[in-house]
């Protein structure tokens, strides 16, 4: 190995200067006594190398690149060798930015998977390998005093979410949670969340059903629909409020919202709809009056309202 490059820093802020030195050992006797060291960044020759012979007989060339505007490039030092360029050594240079503060950190408790799932926005591209770690601790109070640390949660590459499993959670107790971003240029931390996992619980939605007509019950009036729902059993003991949305299947009508409905209603007569019209309906619920997240909308139920009553009965609807 005849040559060796050393750099002021292999990773710098994008646009910052970088200084490199290439030293050629004296015992490389096959070289010219006064070889001219050339510099190349990627495929481009770089002027401005200052060359000198050191007291021990080695040759040194120093170059300063005033602005490294490539996020990744190879810097090499070389000699002319016959008609070709002989590479003596090369180093990889990286340029980018320190991580921005991760923002919009939010979490939800999934009672089915028994895990607290947190997600965040990582901020602008750093152009450098950047690791994110979800850090947390248990706290008896409002997270001012730190209790036991919880094992760091490291997302899979490229993901901006992480799941803390049940064994690391304490329900009905606060946890301090934040995201730490780290790369070669620095470290940043998101603002800390302080939350009780149960206060960010996201329930599964109920299943909508048509109400089985019973012999003694009156059939629905024109423009009305009778429906019922089967609550998600594991969430049954959590007080909730629910809301329905509906729209005609045909046409461009937007969803109309009906609510709040208590989960316990379990059945509902929806009126004021167009007669003889097919409707799509969905329901969702949220823990209430305690804090929580809305469930997803349930799978759709499709129902048709009955025909309008004959004209000679029309006056009954006004009483």
């Amino acid at each position: 190995e005849c040559g060796h490059i050393s750099v002021s820093a292999p990773i710098v802020h994008l646009g910052d200067p970088i200084t490199a030195s290439c030293i050629i050992k004296q015992n490389c006797s096959h070289l010219d006594p006064e070889p001219q060291i050339l510099w190349r960044l990627g495929a481009e020759l770089q002027p401005g190398g200052r060359q000198q012979r050191l007291s021990d007989g080695t040759q040194e060339s120093i170059i300063t690149l005033p602005h490294l505007n490539h996020t990744q490039a190879f810097l090499s030092c070389a000699l002319n060798w016959g008609n070709s360029l002989q590479i003596l050594d090369q180093v990889e240079l990286r340029a980018g930015y320190p991580p921005a503060i991760p923002h919009n950190l939010s979490c939800l408790m999934n009672l089915t998977t028994s895990s607290l799932i947190c997600q965040w926005e990582p901020g602008p591209e750093t152009h450098l390998p950047t690791s994110f770690t979800l850090k947390s601790f248990k706290s008896r109070g409002n997270c001012q005093t730190q209790g036991d640390s919880i094992l760091d949660c490291v997302p899979k590459d490229g993901q901006s979410h992480c799941s803390i499993p049940r064994k690391h959670l304490l329900l009905y107790q606060n946890m301090g949670i934040w995201v730490q971003a780290e790369n070669a240029l620095g470290t940043s931390m998101s603002p800390q969340l302080c939350l009780d996992p149960m206060d960010v619980v996201k329930l599964e939605p109920p299943m909508l059903r048509t109400m089985d007509p019973s012999p003694e019950a009156a059939p629905p009036q024109a423009g009305c629909l009778q429906l019922s729902w089967e609550p998600w059993q594991p969430g049954l003991h959590i007080n909730q409020k629910c809301e329905l949305r509906h729209k005609p299947q045909r046409g461009e009508a937007s969803w109309a919202l009906v609510g709040p409905l208590p989960l316990e209603a379990l059945q509902y007569e929806l009126c004021g709809l167009l007669p003889a019209t097919a409707y799509t309906l969905q329901i969702r619920c949220i823990r209430w009056p305690l804090p929580g997240h809305w469930s997803d909308w349930s799978p759709s139920l499709e129902l048709r309202t009955t025909e309008r009553a004959p004209t000679h009965h029309h006056h009954h609807h006004h009483h």
Epitope: L111, S114, M198, Q233, P234, L236, H237, E264, L266
Partner: antibody
Framework: EVQLLESGGGLVQPGGSLRLSCAAS????????MGWVRQAPGKGLEWVSS????????PYADSVKGRFTISRDNSKNTLYLQMNSLRAEDTAVYYC???????????WGQGTLVTVSS | DIQMTQSPSSLSASVGDRVTITCRAS??????LNWYQQKPGKAPKLLIY???NLQNGVPSRFSGSGSGTDFTLTISSLQPEDFATYYC?????????FGGGTKVEIK
């Protein structure tokens, strides 16, 4: 401090009726599911029935369905179990319990003994 | 209905022993598994809920683990006051069901 106090147990003949009460204090009764669990002498625990916070949902064990009725009066902070057509196998200590959001029975009363015998 | 099978039905142990009780559900119940302690003539007392959460006031020598169908209650160092009967209960869906109980006796 949460307290649950059952009453209404006693000796009753087969086919007879009994109404158990559970007076609750120390928490906002109207916000919680409540339930009844029984334990026959020398046996394990058996869930009997539960009731939602406003009384709209009332699941029952198959063994008591159609014979027992659970109810609550939120204005009186009281849970009830009306037991009709009683059988010898209904003999047990009956406990009332306050349920948590995950179905756990967080607090229990001291129990009241129901004996069905001729 | 979901059947809950507890084992062993009884065990003898000494003060200071590590004791493990298992509970198996006949179908998956996620983490909806609760553990209770009952002493003779007394009402049951909640120890662990949602498989691994220690109820307030319960000593930290009690711990719970497992999910799906297989669950464990562990007493890390048995104390004189821990001799009792222990029950598991699933609250995943109705009807709620209890295990048959495990009686922990003094060796």
């Amino acid at each position: 401090e949460v307290q649950l106090l059952e009453s209404g147990g006693g000796l009753v003949q087969p086919g007879g009726s009994l109404r158990l009460s559970c007076a609750a204090s120390g928490f906002t009764f109207s916000l919680y599911w409540m339930g009844w669990v029984r334990q026959a002498p020398g046996k394990g625990l058996e869930w009997v029935s539960s009731i939602s916070s406003s009384g709209g949902v009332t699941p029952y064990a198959d063994s008591v369905k159609g014979r027992f009725t659970i109810s609550r009066d939120n204005s009186k902070n009281t849970l009830y179990l009306q037991m009709n057509s009683l059988r010898a196998e209904d003999t047990a200590v009956y406990y009332c319990a306050k349920l948590g959001e995950l179905g756990q029975m967080v607090y229990w009363g001291q129990g009241t003994l129901v004996t069905v015998s001729s | 209905d979901i059947q809950m099978t507890q084992s062993p039905s009884s065990l003898s142990a000494s003060v200071g022993d590590r004791v493990t009780i298992t509970c198996r559900a006949s179908q998956g119940i996620s983490s909806y598994l609760n553990w209770y302690q009952q002493k003779p003539g007394k009402a049951p007392k909640l120890l662990i809920y949602y498989a691994s959460n220690l109820q307030n006031g319960v000593p930290s020598r009690f711990s719970g683990s497992g999910s799906g169908t297989d669950f464990t209650l562990t007493i890390s160092s048995l104390q004189p006051e821990d001799f009792a009967t222990y029950y598991c209960q699933q609250s995943f869906k109705y009807p709620m069901t209890f295990g048959g109980g495990t009686k922990v006796e003094i060796k």
